[in-house]
Every structure is written in C-alpha cells, then in structure tokens.
C-alpha cells in the first residue's frame, strides 16, 4: 500500500533530525582538539524509554545543555553555528512531538556523554523511520 502523505512528512522530518544529529556527532568525532576531552566530561540525561515521537520531549529538554557544550568547541566541523543547528533541531522536534500533548519525560538514573547521548537519539530516529517504511 502507498505510504500516506502524513507518514512521508514524518519520515522526512525524522530524516532532517537525523541529519542534524549526525552532523553534530560527525563534528565531534572529527574534532582533533584537547577540547574534545572537556566536552566528554559534560553529562546528559538519557530517556528511560524512547520508542514514540512523544518521547522527543526528553531530547527537547536537553537541547540547551547540548548547545552550551557545542559552543565550547568553536569548530567549523559542525557546518553551521551551534545556535543555528540547535534552532533547526528544536523546530523539527516541536513539529514531530506536537505542541499540544504534555508529556513528562522520565530519565534514566545513569547520565551519558555527548557521544552516547547523540548515539541514543540517532538510533531512536532511525528506528522510527524503519517502522514507518
């Protein structure tokens, strides 16, 4: 059966979110600088559960800390300024999770590094895309 237009739109939004998150991860992994060590000392909260679009609330709540860590890097590896990257991500997250639903995010007990955090959300996006295909 043909994929509905709303599903296709969701897939494209998730692809855009993936692109931004992978861009950040790519920039960090390419970052040959002592600042990388410092970046990895910052801790991020991870969702206890992330299987539905509403769980993107947990990502939204960590976008400010993410921007602060990226500002440390002052690197051209991110292709865009951290503020613009985070702004892009914020817009997409709001569209995907919807602004009407109020969802209280539950966080796991263990915190994570920026690399673990990004890997978790990239995996989440790819997983949702796969289920929509």
């Amino acid at each position: 059966a043909p994929t509905s237009s709303s599903t296709k739109k969701t897939q494209l939004q998730l692809e855009h979110l993936l692109l931004d998150l992978q861009m950040i991860l790519n920039g960090i992994n390419n970052y040959k600088n002592p600042k990388l060590t410092r970046m990895l000392t910052f801790k991020f909260y991870m969702p206890k559960k992330a299987t539905e679009l509403k769980h993107l609330q947990c990502l939204e709540e960590e976008l400010k800390p993410l921007e602060e860590v990226l500002n440390l890097a002052q690197s051209k590896n991110f292709h865009l300024r951290p503020r613009d990257l985070i702004s892009n991500i914020n817009v997409i997250v709001l569209e995907l999770k919807g602004s009407e639903t109020t969802f209280m995010c539950e966080y796991a007990d263990e915190t994570a590094t920026i690399v673990e955090f990004l890997n978790r959300w990239i995996t989440f996006c790819q997983s949702i895309i796969s289920t929509l295909t």
Epitope: Q22, N26, I122
Partner: nanobody, 118 residues
Framework: QVQLLESGGGLVQPGGSLRLSCATS????????MGWYRQAPGKQRELVAV???????NYADSVKGRFTISRDNSKDTMYLQMNSLRAEDTAVYYC????????????WGQGTLVTVSS
C-alpha cells in the same frame, strides 16, 4: 579520502530546469541513505529530497512534483532533476550520504549554487 562532489548548479530563469549531480566514492554509496538539502542566506536549512538505499524517495512539500531525486548505483552518482524553478529555490544545494547503522558516519559535499533569476 572520502568525497562527495556536487555539480550542475548555475543561473537559470524562472520556469527553467537544472540537473544537479553528486558523485561519490563507491564506499559511501550503496546502501546508504542519501539526499539533498539547501541553505539560503538568512533561512533555515531545508531538507529537499531523500533517497534510501532501497530507492524509496521523499520530498519537501515545497518541491514536490517539481524535483526528482534518483541514484545510479553503477556510476556511484545521485541526481536532483529540478524543473519549474522559482526564485525561492535560489540557494546553495548540498548532497549528503549517511550510514543507517553505527557508527553513523555522515558525509557531505561543498555545495553548488543555484540562482533562479530573470
């Protein structure tokens, strides 16, 4: 060194057509999700079109019915056929290729400028 190289940009009149190409090294082509995004000065980056490793395509509403994304596995090249171009399509167009499994490697080109103006 892994590279993506865009070509085909230029100046075109409204209503005209252009075909962008993205040449890649084979190691980052087959099986990877690929796409085109554009960046216009002072605007949010826009994801224009995507094609999965299996050939599934997806388009932004703003280009649907006008743009067509395709890939030629034998040439390790992806294309974006742009028809009925409008002034608002003016932007730098970048192609990208991303892994769909860890370690989530991402590659993108230097971009090609498309200017739609009379």
């Amino acid at each position: 060194q892994v590279q993506l190289l865009e070509s085909g940009g230029g100046l075109v009149q409204p209503g005209g057509s252009l075909r962008l190409s993205c040449a890649t090294s084979g190691t980052i082509f087959s099986g990877y999700t690929m796409g085109w995004y554009r960046q216009a000065p002072g605007k949010q980056r826009e994801l224009v079109a995507v094609i999965s490793g299996g050939g599934d395509t997806n388009y932004a509403d703003s280009v649907k019915g006008r743009f067509t994304i395709s890939r030629d596995n034998s040439k390790d090249t992806m294309y974006l056929q742009m028809n009925s171009l409008r002034a608002e399509d003016t932007a730098v167009y970048y192609c990208y290729s991303r892994e769909v499994t860890p370690p989530w490697k991402l590659y993108w080109g230097q971009g090609t400028l498309v200017t739609v103006s009379s």
